[in-house]
C-alpha cells in the first residue's frame, strides 16, 4: 500500500517522497495526465500502469500491505502473503529504483507542477 511505497522510495532514493515526489511533474502522486515531463515523471507513469494492471486483476493496491527486506541498498520482495501483495511489491520496487536511477535529472521546478499545464497525449500502458 501507500505506506509501503513511501518507505521503500525513501530507503532507495534517500529522499522524503512527500517532499520530493508526491506530487512531481504530471504523473507522480495521485492521478496523472498528459506527456511525462522528464525521466522521473516517466517512472511514475510506468508505475501508474503497473497499478492499473493490478487493479484489473482485482488487487487492492492502496490497502494491501506487503512484506519486504531492504539491505545493502537492495529490495527483496518477500514471498510471503498473497499474489497481489507480491506483485504490488514488485511494482513499488521498480518505481523506487527508477526514481533512484534518475536522481541526476531531478528538477525542483517540477515539484508541485501545475497539472493544468500537463498537455499532450497521455502515454498508453
Amino acid at each position: 500500500g501507500i505506506l509501503n511505497l513511501n518507505k521503500m522510495v525513501k530507503q532507495v532514493t534517500g529522499k522524503m517522497p512527500i517532499l520530493s515526489y508526491w506530487p512531481y511533474g504530471c504523473h507522480c502522486g495521485l492521478g496523472g495526465r498528459g506527456q511525462p515531463k522528464d525521466a522521473t515523471d516517466w517512472c511514475c507513469q510506468t508505475h501508474d500502469c503497473c497499478y492499473d494492471h493490478l487493479k484489473t486483476q482485482g488487487c487492492s493496491i492502496y490497502k494491501d500491505y506487503y512484506r519486504y527486506n531492504f539491505s545493502q541498498g537492495n529490495i527483496h520482495c518477500s514471498d510471503k502473503g498473497s499474489w497481489c501483495e507480491q506483485q504490488l511489491c514488485a511494482c513499488d520496487k521498480e518505481v523506487a529504483f527508477c526514481l533512484k536511477r534518475n536522481l541526476d535529472t531531478y528538477q525542483k521546478r517540477l515539484r508541485f507542477y501545475w497539472r493544468p499545464h500537463c498537455r499532450g497525449q497521455t502515454p498508453g500502458c
Partner: antibody, heavy 120, light 106 residues
Framework: QVTLKESGPGILQSSQTLSLTCSFS??????????VSWIRQPSGKGLEWLAH???????RYNPSLKSRLTISKDTSRNQVFLKISNVDTADAATYYC????????????WGTGTTVTVSS | QIVLTQSPAIMSASPGEKVTISCSAS?????MYWYQQKPGSSPKPWIY???NLASGVPARFSGSGSGTSYSLTISSMEAEDAATYYC?????????FGGGTKLEIK
C-alpha cells in the same frame, strides 16, 4: 518425505480454549520461505483457512476469527500450535495443518487431521 | 475477501463420461488451485496454477480458466475419480476455498 500430524483434545466444552499441535518432519521451519497453516472442516462441510505462521515467526490470521486465534511454533521440536479461545459448537470440526512452501499460493502437503467435538 | 462458488454442489457421472466442475470467483484472481478429497482422508493437491497437474494426478484431468471463471475437467470419468473437489485462491488475503463439488460414480 514430508509428513504432518495433528493432535488435540478430541472433546472439550463450550467457552474453553482449544489447543492443537501439529508435529511435522521432512522440512524445517527455520528454512526461509517455509510456513504452516491451520485449516478446518466441519463434518460434511467445506474448508476454512484459519492461520499461518512463517519461518521468521511472522503470522497471518483469518480476519473473521482473528480475535480468538493464536498461532505459534517451536522450531527446534518441529511443531506448530494453534489456540482457539472461547469455543462453541460451531468450532467442532476436523482440524488440519498444511505446509505452504516457497513462492506457492497453495498447500502442498496436509496432515491427516484431528477431530474436535465441542459439547455444550 | 474473495468468495469462491462451486457448481454443481453434487453431480454423478458414468464411467467414460466427460465431467466439468466450475469455480466462480467474486472478483478476478490470477490462478486457481484444486484439491481432491475422499471420505476419511485429507485434501490432496490436484491442480496448481490453474492448469498444472500435481504429482501423480492422471492425465485425464485438466484445469483451465481466467479472471473469475475456472474449471476442472475429467476427460473420461473413472471410478477412482469419485471424490469431493475444492477450488482455492490466494490471489488476495485471506486464502479462501470453494464449497466443494461432490462427484459420484453412476
Amino acid at each position: 518425505q514430508v509428513t504432518l500430524k495433528e493432535s488435540g483434545p478430541g472433546i472439550l466444552q463450550s467457552s474453553q480454549t482449544l489447543s492443537l499441535t501439529c508435529s511435522f518432519s521432512g522440512f524445517s521451519l527455520s528454512t526461509s520461505s517455509m510456513g504452516v497453516s491451520w485449516i478446518r472442516q466441519p463434518s460434511g462441510k467445506g474448508l476454512e483457512w484459519l492461520a499461518h505462521i512463517y519461518w521468521d515467526d511472522d503470522k497471518r490470521y483469518n480476519p473473521s476469527l482473528k480475535s480468538r486465534l493464536t498461532i505459534s511454533k517451536d522450531t527446534s521440536r518441529n511443531q506448530v500450535f494453534l489456540k482457539i479461545s472461547n469455543v462453541d459448537t460451531a468450532d467442532a470440526a476436523t482440524y488440519y495443518c498444511a505446509r505452504r512452501a516457497g513462492n506457492f499460493f497453495y498447500f502442498d502437503v496436509w496432515g491427516t487431521g484431528t477431530t474436535v467435538t465441542v459439547s455444550s | 475477501q474473495i468468495v469462491l462458488t462451486q457448481s454443481p454442489a453434487i453431480m454423478s457421472a458414468s464411467p467414460g463420461e466427460k465431467v466439468t466442475i466450475s469455480c466462480s470467483a467474486s472478483s478476478s484472481v490470477s490462478y486457481m488451485y484444486w484439491y481432491q478429497q475422499k471420505p476419511g482422508s485429507s485434501p490432496k493437491p490436484w491442480i496448481y496454477r490453474t492448469s498444472n497437474l500435481a504429482s501423480g494426478v492422471p492425465a485425464r484431468f485438466s484445469g483451465s480458466g481466467s479472471g473469475t471463471s475456472y474449471s476442472l475437467t475429467i476427460s473420461s470419468m473413472e471410478a477412482e475419480d469419485a471424490a469431493t473437489y475444492y477450488c482455492q485462491q490466494y490471489h488476495t488475503y485471506p486464502p479462501t476455498f470453494g464449497g466443494g463439488t461432490k462427484l459420484e460414480i453412476k
